[in-house]
């Protein structure tokens, strides 16, 4: 089809349409025409969008030009930038694609300029006078969703005719934006009209399920239905799906409502939305979003442990102070000559049979977010430090009010009775940052790195993962906790909640994809206190960014119900945050602001062996070692492993300004 025929034409994807209007207009007239239809002049910012424009424009004549949404005011040359000082009509200069016909040449740029796209060849961008009436213009229309084009039916008299909300009529669409109308003419005479509407369960779909035309009933091809075909009284056929499936937007195929992993933990077909979400034991549905699960803090329940309790995501553990040991009930403590012990109260364990082990366990340990709680009336004891675990440096407390943190000798019960080996990373926080984040990205299981099962003693300080404290995107920047990571953290206490599973390999089922389980919050300060850092240790600084995904804190938080520990004095280095790369690259993790990964034990591409840290004991020679990526050069190296939940408005490869930095537009600019 000749795109230069009198009629406009368009190409739609699932979230936007481009439309070509072969009407001679000045830039301002074209901009207004697109706006009046609810769109904007086309802004092909990515190679993918440019490809859609190329397909739409096709192989037109070399003499024809089409306005796109780029303009530049007089004397606004910025020839070194990808857009050369031009601004999209949406108000920003962000782009990952340009297609200039010529290299930038110096000049004063004395006049306002606008950009037109050549209709022929490679559809290059040319700049010129905005008041020139070129041959046509390209509009872009965004929308909330799209319906797939209807499949032709046996009883149809011809292809469906679609009318979009921006008044384009065609039979050629692959996707129809929300609000489009489909008109189907049937051989039997009667036709049908369908509307692309919002569906009650979310998304958009056609207002009526097919088949639309009376045909030969359910034979010969099951009426086009994937599962069941039902012949109605009026000769009409309708499709139905077997239990656990729902009818797709095309009215013929069936889909598993859980296939898109709408639930954070467990999804079950059925219910008003076609599915219902459930949480594993130890979790409960979040109040603000029943799709998400939040940890139940059992340590808040009075008497859950006789002495000390640590809550972790998905369970809790009871501990006894030095000189006491945990009784068989896992709750009580009794005096003993032996060192303290602990029992795991993992709420999943006793309910699991072998078939469920791998499905319901242990992703919680990827993002450990538990907290220590001392039961009322128990005094802190003097620490006992094993000879090979000397404390390299520790927090200092004022005068003789120094509370003592117990470091009891670990005891190693059989794996089945105590499936977890407690382990802390080194940051102990007196007060946990306040978190008001309501939503955390969840990642499909395919993107989740495995947790390596292992049973080993607490790790020496040279084999610990540096802690990267959480940054919460939904807090205003003034209230966000500072972030600092230590490349060689302090010696941990021997008794710590584990980072590594001892029992269940991580094989997530298709409908479970939590990477960031919610953590319970205590305390009101937004400062994370760290042990003092010796002068020969350079801190790992992570960059903050507005689009950064939340990072699950992997250090437990020390909490006491009796006494609030004093804040560590100013002798400790202040927390460091940076919005651009620090000067010294020696030990830094430099992460693009919009794509910063979660600080989780993640298997990353292999890098230089220096400065690597590991949660795996050296006694496990065959274990793979998670490595924290390093940034020694200017270019980020994280793109290869970023989760799919990375924000879509990430800075582009061409380094243009953030989408957030919108330039105010008024009509004078056009």
């Amino acid at each position: 089809q000749d795109p230069w025929a009198a009629e406009p034409r368009s190409a739609c994807g699932p979230s936007s349409c481009y439309a070509l209007f072969p009407r001679r207009r000045t830039f301002l007239e074209a901009w207004r025409a697109c706006r009046e239809l609810g769109g904007d002049l086309a802004t092909p910012r990515t190679p993918e969008e440019a490809q859609r424009v190329d397909n739409l424009v096709g192989a037109g004549p070399a003499s024809r030009l089409l306005w796109i949404g780029l303009q530049r005011q007089a004397r606004q040359c910025q020839l070194q930038r990808p857009l050369r000082g031009f601004t999209w009509t949406t108000g920003d200069q962000d782009t990952a694609f340009t297609n200039w016909a010529q290299p930038a040449t110096g000049g004063p740029c004395p006049a306002q300029r606008c950009v037109a796209l050549e209709a022929s060849g490679e559809h290059r961008w040319l700049e010129g006078s905005c008041t020139l009436a070129v041959d046509g213009y390209l509009c872009q229309f965004g929308f909330e969703g799209a319906c797939p084009a209807l499949q032709d039916e046996a009883g149809q008299a011809g292809p469906a005719v679609y009318t979009t909300p921006f008044h384009l009529v065609s039979t050629e669409f692959e996707w129809l934006p929300f609000g489009s109308v489909a008109a189907v003419q049937c051989q039997a005479g009667r036709g049908a009209s369908l509307l692309c509407v919002k569906q009650p369960e979310g998304g958009v779909g056609w207002s009526r399920a097919g088949p639309l035309c009376l045909g030969a009933g359910c034979s010969p091809d099951n009426g086009g239905c994937e599962h069941e075909c039902v012949e109605e009284v009026d000769g009409h056929v309708s499709c139905r799906c077997t239990e656990g499936f729902r009818l797709a937007a095309d009215g013929r195929s069936c889909e598993d409502p859980c296939a898109q992993a709408p639930c954070e933990q467990q999804c079950e077909p059925g219910g008003p939305q076609g599915y219902s979400c459930h949480c594993r034991l130890g979790f409960r549905p979040a109040e603000d979003d029943p799709h998400r699960c939040v940890d139940t803090d059992e340590c808040q329940i009075a008497g859950v442990c006789q002495q000390m309790c640590v809550n972790y995501v998905g369970g809790f553990e009871c501990y006894c102070s030095e000189g006491h040991e945990l009784e068989a009930d896992g709750i009580s403590c009794s005096p003993a000559g032996a060192m303290g012990a602990r029992a795991s109260q993992d709420l999943g364990d006793e309910l699991l049979d072998d078939g469920e082990d791998e499905e319901d366990e242990d992703e919680a340990w990827e993002a450990f977010g538990g907290g220590w709680t001392e039961m009322p009336g128990i005094l802190w004891m003097e620490p006992t430090q094993p000879p090979d675990f000397a404390l390299a440096y520790r927090p200092s407390f004022p005068e003789d009010r120094e509370p003592q943190i117990p470091y009891p000798e670990p005891t190693w019960p059989p794996p089945l009775s105590a499936p977890r080996v407690p382990y802390h990373s080194s940051v102990l926080s007196v007060t946990r940052p306040v978190v008001v984040s309501a939503t955390r990205p969840t990642l499909p299981s395919a993107h989740q790195p495995p947790v390596i099962p292992a049973t080993h003693p607490a790790l020496s300080r040279d084999h610990q993962i540096p802690v990267i404290a959480a940054n919460y995107p939904d807090l205003p920047s003034a209230y966000q906790p500072g972030i600092l990571s230590v490349s060689h953290p302090a010696q941990p206490p021997a008794h710590q909640p584990p980072m590594i599973s001892t029992r269940y390999p991580e094989l997530f089922p298709a409908h479970q994809s939590p990477m960031f389980p919610d953590t319970q919050v205590a305390g009101t300060q937004t400062t994370t206190h760290l042990p003092a850092i010796p002068p020969n240790r350079a801190p790992l600084v992570t960059t903050l960014g507005a689009h950064q995904p939340p990072q699950a804190p992997d250090a437990p938080v020390l909490r006491t119900q009796a006494t609030q520990l004093p804040i560590i004095p100013t002798a400790q280095p202040s927390l460091t945050t940076s919005s651009r790369s620090p000067v010294s690259p020696a030990h830094q993790v430099s992460v693009p602001a919009a794509t910063q990964p979660p600080a989780l034990p993640t298997l990353l591409p292999s890098q230089s062996p220096t400065n690597q840290t590991s949660p795996i004991s050296p006694t496990h020679p065959h274990s793979k070692v998670p490595q924290i990526p390093r940034e020694d050069g200017p270019s980020p190296k994280l793109a290869l492993w970023l989760p799919s939940a990375a924000p879509t408005a990430a800075p582009t490869a061409l380094g243009e300004a953030s989408l957030a930095e919108h330039i105010q537009r008024d009509d004078r600019w056009l």
């Epitope: 004549p61 030009l65 040449t105 306002q112 050549e118």
Partner: antibody
């Protein structure tokens, strides 16, 4: 090199018609619009109309509408301008000119190549 | 229709002189203006397009400026071959081209 070669001079009586030709060479004929421009003695240049050889799209100056017809023969890379109902004030030099598409990354609709012109004399 | 008025209509100058010709539009034409040089018995030749861009092969002594309604063609140092008639042209309401009445540049 790009060339536009026009047909020779014409002498016509009032009321007659004249058809001028403009043969293009040195470029892809269908890629560029052809305009016709009139220059009467001592007068400014006057645009008459254009044709896009790609699809035969034409537009005319209202002043000449109904009297002028522009056509092309793409196989011969030639544009034609026919002027009917000639009158004395049609005596002029008629130029065909190619509209440029882009120069050094700029789009522009100025006329970059011109034919040598054809003198049409209308006299009784 | 958009009208273009050139001034002066006639201009006498000597070789080496700096010469400026002005073209005024009856309404805003942005930068959709070109300048042509025409010698007697010859077709016009494009000098400047888009108000200020020198066409390929045109000597650097020719320059154009302006936008909106006022435009100028400047010849920085007249050469003998520059004596000719100069026309401005607007094409903002393309395809409706209009031309100025011309400026005849003569040797003094």
């Amino acid at each position: 090199q790009v060339q536009l070669v026009q047909s020779g001079p014409e002498v016509k009586k009032p009321g007659a018609s004249v058809k001028l030709s403009c043969k293009a060479s040195g470029y892809t004929f269908t890629d560029y619009v052809i305009h016709w421009v009139k220059q009467a003695p001592g007068q400014r240049l006057e645009w008459m109309g254009y044709i896009n050889p790609y699809d035969d799209d034409t537009t005319y100056n209202q002043k000449f509408k109904g009297r002028v017809t522009i056509t092309v023969d793409t196989s011969a890379s030639t544009a034609y301008m026919e002027l009917n109902s000639l009158r004395s004030e049609d005596t002029a030099v008629y130029y065909c000119a190619r509209r440029g598409n882009s120069y050094d990354g700029y789009f522009d609709y100025s006329m970059d190549y011109w034919g040598q012109g054809t003198l049409v004399t209308v006299s009784s | 229709d958009i009208q273009l008025t050139q001034s002066p209509s006639f201009l006498s100058a000597s070789v080496g002189d700096r010469v400026t010709i002005t073209c005024r539009a009856s309404q805003n034409v942005g930068t959709a203006v070109a300048w042509y040089q025409q010698k007697p018995g010859k077709a016009p030749k494009l000098l400047i397009y888009s108000a200020s861009n020198r066409y390929t092969g045109v000597p650097s002594r020719f320059s154009g400026s302006g936008s909106g309604t006022e435009f100028t063609l400047t010849i920085s140092s007249l050469q003998p071959e520059d004596f000719a008639t100069y026309y401005c042209q607007q094409y903002t309401n393309y395809p409706m081209y209009t031309f100025g009445q011309g400026t005849k540049l003569e040797i003094k």
